[in-house]
């Protein structure tokens, strides 16, 4: 299936140009999306091109500026947040990135009623997290690892926690491992729906081993960065959940929420918190051996002033074939009765589907079914459930939005997006206003992305929010590569692949092949999305064929494929890349003497193992920030898929699956190893150990480090990285500069 045909015709050839590396590094062909900042059923905020904050009312068609760019500029604000009572706006400035999601910032409160900044009892700086209550204008914020509450922006703060300590105790914000591998947020506090209660997590990292690395900076002596970071098998953070009444917080004090007995009996994680009503909360817990998850519904007992989590409201989710959930355990979406909920988990056939749970998980009613997967539940209203899946036309790399009518029996299903812009749009997400009165659809491809506004009742398109016209015009004279998404059937395994072909691709010719791999558990690389990136350039200008293959361990195609890698990472992911390459060679247009593989992070691990597989298939390859041994990576992620590195568990495979163990096999390939020295995620240690093993084996290789750069290798390092990799590949493929 050709998803993005080249628009090249002979008559136009002389006016068309190939992509350049400069185009990619400058972001010349980047696209925009439009996500409304919903503030009611029919109103949203949006930051205009000139930085005014504008309120749009869909029903009246009116819009007005609620905050001028002048006010924004007066404090150098880069972000904002309107209080639900619309009396105040917080303005965020001095953004300072910490880890993937976390950052600190300075916050100013602007009073919309008098057009002035709130003076007196100003917020301290820098703040780690700040948010409004869902109703009114209470503020909760985290400063120096402690949580504070303001009843009104001008009021003095009430300190809720006192034990916060850098790198030791985290209140209301996650530590490194919870941020990266469990919550995927910068916050760990949650307001109840009407702002009566505030729930928060406390993470105790006192006993966690610390990763230390040098940050060279500009000073005479480097700084040492210390992060409590539990590697596989190490001591983990200890988590507690508390809830405090925010109306009169000084009286009762924080109430600790009990952990289910079956969870508390051994090491465990807290995985998420969902408020149902002001007096009902749902907590999800997970055993350290991550195949058992417990969802616990707790009720506030007014007469006892306590949170009661009866055993009858504990719902167990267990996997017998792998780990619980997909990448994360899914979160529940509660229905209007405030006790039953919808949740995605594996059905009896091993496909992730929506289930309705009223009393017990055993009695769950399956809402969706088929040899495809439900991916996200966006919204449940009284009569509709909106979700995304990859059902349509059996392409796992697509996302369409569906509506199920739950108000009628039997429930009827309608695909909202399948036929809207069928060629252009096959990968959607959505954003819903209150009560799903309206929603925005954001289409990511395969054509140029487009964002549209829709009526939540009729699904009618109301207007285009962003259609990337400038991008469309800019691409008119560009020779884009062709892209096709197809599948290989090998030994009862379906391997979906995306192939990016040079604009004047000729099947009778031979082309160098570059495999781009990620391949991590529950990932998906073969997606019907638009991108003009480095590999687009390599196909367009340098005439390479690039292929991405989703092998065993990847997501959204059922548990058989997903859980195939359970407890044996580094085996089947590599095998399936190799199998695909052999199939590509059979297609006849690949120069089998010029095949390379590259990947980043997990992809760097897979590419390294593929190069060291001893197959002789690969001439060269690149590993950027690779994992080299699972003993070096984070406990939460690693143990989910590998178990523990202990003799009585899975130590043997931990040892067998290292890159270092295969050092000898790099002798006949050209290997480029790249890593940032300040990588907080996949530590530089990983590449240091690969390099040491290669040196000890007297194997030649190339390497590049990026001083003081993290796992993202951002800024000027990005330009240097892609330029360096380009030279390496062109040399490998004997392409002239």
């Amino acid at each position: 299936i050709v998803l993005r045909p080249s628009r090249v015709h002979n008559s136009e050839e002389n006016t068309m140009r190939a992509l350049t590396l400069k185009d990619i590094l400058n972001g010349t062909f980047s696209y925009k999306t439009f996500f409304p900042n919903w503030i009611s059923g029919q109103e949203y905020l949006h930051q205009s091109a000139d930085n005014n904050i504008v309120l749009y009312n869909i029903e009246t068609g009116q819009s007005y500026t609620i905050l001028s760019n002048r006010t924004m500029k007066s404090v150098n604000a880069s972000n904002y947040g309107l209080s639900p009572d619309r009396q105040f706006v917080y303005l965020e400035s001095d953004y300072s990135k910490l880890w993937r999601y976390s950052y600190t910032a300075t916050y100013y409160i602007y009073d919309l009623s008098n057009g002035e900044f709130v003076r007196g009892n100003e917020l301290p700086r820098p703040i780690q997290y700040l948010c409004w209550s869902p109703v009114g204008s209470k503020l909760a914020y985290v400063y120096q690892n402690n949580i504070y509450l303001k009843q009104r922006p001008g009021d003095p703060p009430f300190q809720i926690t006192f034990n916060g300590r850098e790198n030791k105790i985290f209140n209301g914000i996650p530590d490194w491992v919870y941020e990266e591998e469990m919550l995927a947020t910068k916050y760990a506090l949650w307001w109840s729906p009407n702002g009566k209660f505030l729930a928060y997590a406390e993470f105790n990292d006192t006993d966690i081993p610390v990763i230390a690395y040098s940050y060279y900076g500009d000073e005479q002596y480097p700084r040492t960065i210390n992060i409590p970071y539990p590697k596989a098998g190490a001591k983990n953070p200890v988590v507690r959940i508390f809830i405090i009444d925010t109306t009169y917080p000084a009286y009762v004090g924080p109430q600790e929420v009990p952990v289910p007995a079956m969870i508390a009996s051994s090491d465990y994680y807290f995985s998420w918190l969902t408020w149902v009503t002001d007096e009902r909360v749902c907590l999800q817990w997970l055993k350290r051996v991550q195949n058992v998850s417990v969802l616990s519904i707790c009720d506030f007992r007014e007469d006892w002033q306590t949170w009661d989590c009866p055993k009858t409201q504990e719902h167990i989710e267990e996997s017998r074939t792998g780990w619980a959930g997909g990448f994360f355990v899914s979160t529940p979406v509660f229905s209007y009765d405030a006790i039953s909920y919808y949740k995605i988990f594996s059905d009896k056939d091993g496909y992730k589907h929506i289930h309705y749970i009223k009393d017990t998980v055993e009695n769950a009613i399956q809402i969706t079914s088929g040899k495809w997967e439900a991916i996200n539940i966006f919204r449940v209203t009284q009569d509709s459930l909106f979700y995304s899946s990859n059902e349509f036309e059996e392409y796992p790399g697509r996302r369409n939005i569906y509506r199920i009518s739950i108000g009628s029996y039997p429930p009827s299903k309608k695909c909202v997006t399948c036929h809207l812009r069928k060629e252009r749009c096959q990968y959607y997400t959505a954003s819903f206003s209150d009560y799903a009165k309206y929603y925005a659809l954001v289409c990511y491809g395969p054509g140029i992305p487009i964002s549209t506004l829709h009526d939540g009742r009729t699904d009618q398109e109301i207007k285009i929010l962003e259609e990337n016209k400038e991008l469309e015009n800019a691409l008119k004279n560009i020779q884009l590569p062709k892209e096709e998404i197809k599948k290989l059937e090998v030994d009862e395994i379906t391997l979906w692949y995306k192939m990016i072909l040079p604009p004047q691709f000729d099947r009778s010719k031979k082309y160098p092949l570059l495999i781009q791999v990620y391949g991590g558990p529950c990932s998906q690389s073969v997606r019907s999305v638009f991108a003009v990136n480095w590999i687009s350039y390599l196909a367009s200008k340098e005439g390479m064929v690039i292929a991405l293959v989703d092998g065993r361990g990847t997501a959204f195609q059922g548990d058989k494929l997903l859980y195939a890698v359970y407890r044996k990472l580094g085996v089947y992911e590599v095998e399936d890349q190799i199998t695909a390459v052999r199939k590509f060679i059979e297609m006849g247009f690949i120069d089998e003497k010029r095949i390379a593989i590259w990947g980043w992070s997990y992809g760097g691990y897979v590419s390294s193992l593929a190069l060291a597989s001893g197959t002789g298939l690969f001439k060269c390859g690149i590993a950027v920030a690779p994992v080299s041994s699972w003993e070096y990576y984070a406990s939460v992620y690693t143990e989910r898929f590998m178990g523990l590195p202990t003799k009585d568990d899975n130590l043997e495979h931990y040892k067998n699956s290292t890159v270092m163990a295969r050092a000898e096999y790099f002798r006949n390939v050209d290997y480029l190893l790249i890593h940032g020295t300040a990588d907080d995620n996949v530590h530089f240690q990983n590449s240091a150990q690969i390099a040491k093993a290669l040196v000890n084996a007297q194997v030649d290789f190339q390497a590049m480090w990026y001083s003081d750069q993290n796992h993202g290798l951002s800024g000027l390092s990005t330009n240097h990285l892609y330029t360096h990799m380009t030279h390496f590949l062109k040399q490998c493929f004997s392409l002239s500069d």
Epitope: Y251, G253, Q255, Q305
Partner: antibody
Amino acid sequence: EVQLLESGGGLVQPGGSLRLSCAASGFTFSSYAMSWVRQAPGKKLEWVSAIIGSGSRTYYADSVKGRFTISRDNSKNTLYLQMNSLRAEDTAVYYCAKGWFGGFNYWGQGTLVTVSS
Amino acid sequence: EIVLTQSPGTLSLSPGERATLSCRASQSVTSSYLAWYQQKPGQAPRLLINVGSRRATGIPDRFSGSGSGTDFTLTISRLEPEDFAVYYCQQGIMLPPTFGQGTKVEIK
């Protein structure tokens, strides 16, 4: 009916130790933060220490930090204050009170601690 | 720590009169975190006005609390004989919780 009953007070020499107890009844003890508040003869009230309902978090006035330890046994509905390295200035009537940092709506009758040689 | 200063130190009034007791904080407190107590000789304090200017359970409506920021007032609209006692204000917004030095309301 809520009742708080302190015990364990008495005469002790400087540097000595005492353990105060407060038996609670008439409410769900484990749900509430509890505090100790003291009052030296003829002086104003002074908050000493607090503990949240589960017992997992404790708080102290600077004047007693490192010397006093607050604890609770929710199975016995009892609050404790272990007082070590006592000083003359710790002489006071010690009250246990229901509440964390404010709105102390129930108080015990108090127990007198006298630190003197 | 927040210092609470009560005035006057002593208030001499007759039964039936109106009593106005003042409490000033060294920094902003807000009514959500200020409480008033009554203490009679040899007895434990008794909560009158709970945080948030709410009357505590069983407290007659002649007692009322008001104020915001740093200035707070306890008003007893008509003094009854049993109201003669020492009154303390207390803040709970900042650790450590602190009490005022007290206002003694005595019979004139």
